[in-house]
């Protein structure tokens, strides 16, 4: 008789999840030699231990602490790039501007990027059929709690000028319910962070509006100012040109506004 299994609303664990996490960890130690000392087997064991045999709606930040400890990493605190709803461009940017880091450029972010995972209460099985959806099922699921934990730690580590890339094509350019709006904004440390600089990325070629005047950006400015952190905002009208100018800053066309 097949054992009854909880059916969740979200997609199941990414196929070959253990192999993917291990392979990513090994690859990370290769491309980031300063993390050579990381024991990828122990990292996987800690990752697995955070959610295996636990109810996937009852995961806590505490469950991830062993993994957080093993993944401890120092990134330059003044070179942090946050993003919201515009991950691909943020990653393209840090691939060119190698001294800046998104969360996914750190070991733990790199391991989990674009993956889904969950287990089942009281069994050592990984659930490849379905996992809880944040809205439809529960917020304290393995994936959401992981990203909340690493995002909080990443924001807490930031200092000086912190940059955030925001998607100007969305109805809410700044969304209070995003990870950036609900976690990172509130965990920037005013005693360390002087300024949050928003880069609003325009979608349309002919879009010359000043999206820094958008009501949601004003809301972000208000939240940040109340936290005693200065706020500044720049329009990036041409993201393609923006990336090109990061690659080739000497290009004569890169002196004008992008």
């Amino acid at each position: 008789v097949p054992r009854w299994r909880q059916q969740w609303s979200g997609p199941g664990t990414t196929k070959r999840f253990p192999e993917t996490v291990l392979a990513r960890c090994v690859k990370y130690t290769e491309i980031h030699p300063e993390m050579r000392h990381v024991d990828c087997q122990s990292v996987w064991d800690a990752f697995k231990g955070a959610f295996i045999s636990k109810h996937p709606c009852n995961i806590t930040e505490e469950d991830y602490q062993p993994l957080m400890k093993l993944g401890t990493q120092t990134v330059p605190c003044n070179k942090i790039l946050l993003w919201s709803r515009i991950k691909d461009l943020a990653h393209q940017f840090t691939q060119v501007q190698r001294d800046m880091f998104t969360l996914e450029d750190t070991l733990l972010g790199y391991l989990a990027d674009d993956l889904t995972w969950c287990g089942e209460f009281n069994t050592s099985k990984i659930n490849y059929q379905s996992c809880p959806d944040w809205r439809k099922d529960c917020s304290n699921n393995p994936v959401s709690v992981f990203w909340k934990t690493v995002s909080r730690r990443f924001a807490e580590a930031a200092c000086d000028v912190v940059h955030v890339m925001l998607n100007g094509s969305r109805s809410k350019i700044f969304d209070k319910n995003s990870t950036f709006g609900s976690v990172e904004v509130h965990n920037l440390q005013p005693e360390k962070v002087q300024t949050l600089e928003a880069w609003v990325i325009h979608g349309g070629r002919e879009d010359s509006r000043d999206l820094c005047q958008d009501p949601t950006i004003k809301e972000l400015e208000s939240i940040i100012s109340k936290r005693n952190i200065q706020f500044s905002c720049k329009n990036i009208y041409r993201p393609d040109k923006f990336l090109q100018c990061v690659k080739n800053p000497e290009d004569s066309s890169c002196t004008s506004e992008i």
């Epitope: 291990l22 392979a23 960890c25 090994v26 690859k27 130690t29 290769e30 030699p33 300063e34 050579r36 000392h37 990381v38 024991d39 990828c40 087997q41 120092t74």
Partner: antibody, heavy 114, light 107 residues
Framework: QVQLQQSGPELVRPGTSVKVSCKAS????????VEWIKQRPGQGLEWIGV????????NYNEKFKGKATLTVDRSSTTAYMHLSGLTSDDSAVYFC???????WGQGTTLTVSS | DIVMTQSQKFMSASVGDRVSITCKAS??????VAWYQQQPGHSPKQLIY???NRYTGVPDRFTGSGAGTDFTLTISNIQSEDLADYFC?????????FGSGTKLEIK
């Protein structure tokens, strides 16, 4: 327990080549990178390069490009270093080592002499 | 390539003494520094990683410190078995590079 067992000493002629092996046991071979290090008698240590046993990708010290070639055989959990165009300058002890926890092989002595 | 300079080629100490072996990097390597001990006739053994973290099983007499360009390995309450060569290594950037080594002699 983790072990890296290297092949025995080699005495070879100048101009020839040699393949040094490093048999890994006691851990999941593809989960840790393997690096190679050269030590000449009474001298310091020189880093040759590193290989990812899972993907086969390598990073070499520029100085050893064309001299050393790193490979792995996953089925036998063995890493290899092929050294070509040997000269007396290549006479040394060669070590393999594993990333994380710094496990080292016992070393392979290479003597290049006519 | 990053040059790791160990200026003390030899150091001499008595059992129970404390010595500090220094290593200077030619550019900032953060904390990506390891220390190795090589006893006569043996393979190097890693003592310290990330500048200050001891590997399991390494006696707490061995302490690493430093960041950026200046690093120190301190051995306190020296024992006769500490007779060895000590090497620093940076692993911040490929190619990894080693210091030339410091030979610790026991009086």
């Amino acid at each position: 327990q983790v072990q890296l067992q290297q092949s025995g000493p080699e005495l070879v002629r100048p101009g020839t080549s040699v393949k040094v092996s490093c048999k890994a046991s006691g851990y999941a071979f593809t989960t840790y990178l393997v690096e190679w290090i050269k030590q000449r008698p009474g001298q310091g240590l020189e880093w040759i390069g590193v290989i990812n046993p899972g993907s086969g990708s390598t990073n070499y010290n520029e100085k050893f490009k064309g001299k050393a070639t790193l490979t792995v055989d996953r089925s036998s959990t063995t890493a290899y270093m092929h050294l070509s165009g040997l000269t007396s300058d290549d006479s040394a002890v060669y070590f393999c080592a594993r990333y994380a926890y710094g496990y080292w092989g016992q070393g392979t002595t290479l003597t290049v002499s006519s | 390539d990053i040059v790791m300079t160990q200026s003390q080629k030899f150091m001499s100490a008595s059992v129970g003494d404390r010595v500090s072996i220094t290593c200077k990097a030619s550019q900032n390597v953060g904390t990506a520094v390891a220390w190795y001990q090589q006893q006569p006739g043996h393979s190097p053994k890693q003592l310290i990683y990330s500048a200050s973290n001891r590997y399991t099983g390494v006696p707490d007499r061995f302490t690493g410190s430093g960041a950026g360009t200046d690093f120190t390995l301190t051995i306190s309450n020296i024992q006769s078995e500490d007779l060895a060569d000590y090497f620093c290594q940076q692993y911040s950037t490929y190619p990894f590079t080693f210091g030339s080594g410091t030979k610790l002699e026991i009086k």
